[in-house]
Interface confidence: low
Amino acid sequence: RKIPKVGHTFFQKPESCPPVPGGSMKLDIGIINENQRVSMSRNIESRSTSPWNYTVTWDPNRYPSEVVQAQCRNLGCINAQGKEDISMNSVPIQQETLVVRRKHQGCSVSFQLEKVLVTVGCTCVTPVIHHVQ
Amino acid sequence: GITIPRNPGCPNSEDKNFPRTVMVNLNIHNRNTNTNPKRSSDYYNRSTSPWNLHRNEDPERYPSVIWEAKCRHLGCINADGNVDYHMNSVPIQQEILVLRREPPHCPNSFRLEKILVSVGCTCVTPIVHHVA
């Protein structure tokens, strides 16, 4: 069965659905589960063999305005002696999230949904070895 | 709320904060980026803390398919390819925003929902506890 996409009407539309102008959708930005908290291990970003730092990007015309991005600290991974091992690679792990973008055109304001790719953390991988023919 | 700069020549009636409900263009910017992590990289297999990806599907949500990572081992894979139990594979979790159909089954009415997903795994050293 086809999974319905945003804006596609694979559903039987209930009578209670709000009227929406063509080409747009109604979006309530009061977040469900707003106060949910991540319960990750402490200092995971420092204790990882592929450690990372966090930076916060801020944009007042985006909702949410703050998006946290991770950056791997090293090219290699940290070995048992605490030294960087460049035979391995620290690589970013990424996840998509949605944000609402506000656009100003003159005095009118419009809203656009946008997919944003967030770097969540890093993992240590074995490199792909390419042999020259 | 979120305060934003706006054109000083515009009428004063506009709220500086994001309104609670907005009408949004149906076309999502950057919509066609690759959402299947199995196709985008093979890190889940090559990592020293490898993970499996589980498909979570919900037609009342956009995106309807989200991939959840589950670490394969308690420990991490060492240079010999064996599990090293002195280290630990842990999930990296992230809060993401998705759209939830509200009221249910409505094609063009949504509410933002925050969900917690495990995106991948990383290998960590333990915190050492000595008994006093």
Epitope: S39, S41 | G75, V83, Y85, H86, I127, H129
Partner: nanobody
Framework: EVQLVESGGGLVQPGGSLRLSCAAS????????MAWYRQAPGNQRELVAA???????EYADSVKGRFTISRDIPENTVYLQMNSLKPEDTAVYYC?????????????????WGQGTQVTVSS
């Protein structure tokens, strides 16, 4: 608070046996690795025997064939059966556990050490 409680140490004659036990508190809910280490006066702490969550065992060469590590999963306990004891086995024996614990609603990975139990082999 996570605790490892060792017991079973004591004074034994050469050739005798002792069984050490180490019980981990309940809030360690997944144990990756449990091990026994020992430290004789003036020496470094050394690994005696270890067992991983998949029941793989590892022994120091000096104790192979004499000592056996085993576990009781429901009781979160690891045992060290020591047979044919020699005077050079005299040391403080420490239990070590690496595992995932719950503390104040947070899960984490920790490396835990017991307070040690004295084993003396002497005639």
């Amino acid at each position: 608070e996570v605790q490892l409680v060792e017991s079973g140490g004591g004074l034994v004659q050469p050739g005798g046996s002792l069984r050490l036990s180490c019980a981990a508190s309940r809030n360690i809910n997944i144990i990756n690795y449990m091990a026994w280490y020992r430290q004789a006066p003036g020496n470094q702490r050394e690994l005696v025997a270890a067992m991983t969550s998949d029941a793989t065992t590892e022994y120091a060469d000096s104790v192979k064939g004499r000592f056996t590590i085993s576990r009781d999963i429901p009781e979160n306990t690891v045992y060290l059966q020591m047979n044919s004891l020699k005077p050079e086995d005299t040391a403080v024996y420490y239990c070590n556990a690496k595992g995932i614990w719950d503390y104040l609603g947070r899960r984490d990975f920790g490396d835990y050490w017991g307070q040690g139990t004295q084993v003396t082999v002497s005639s």
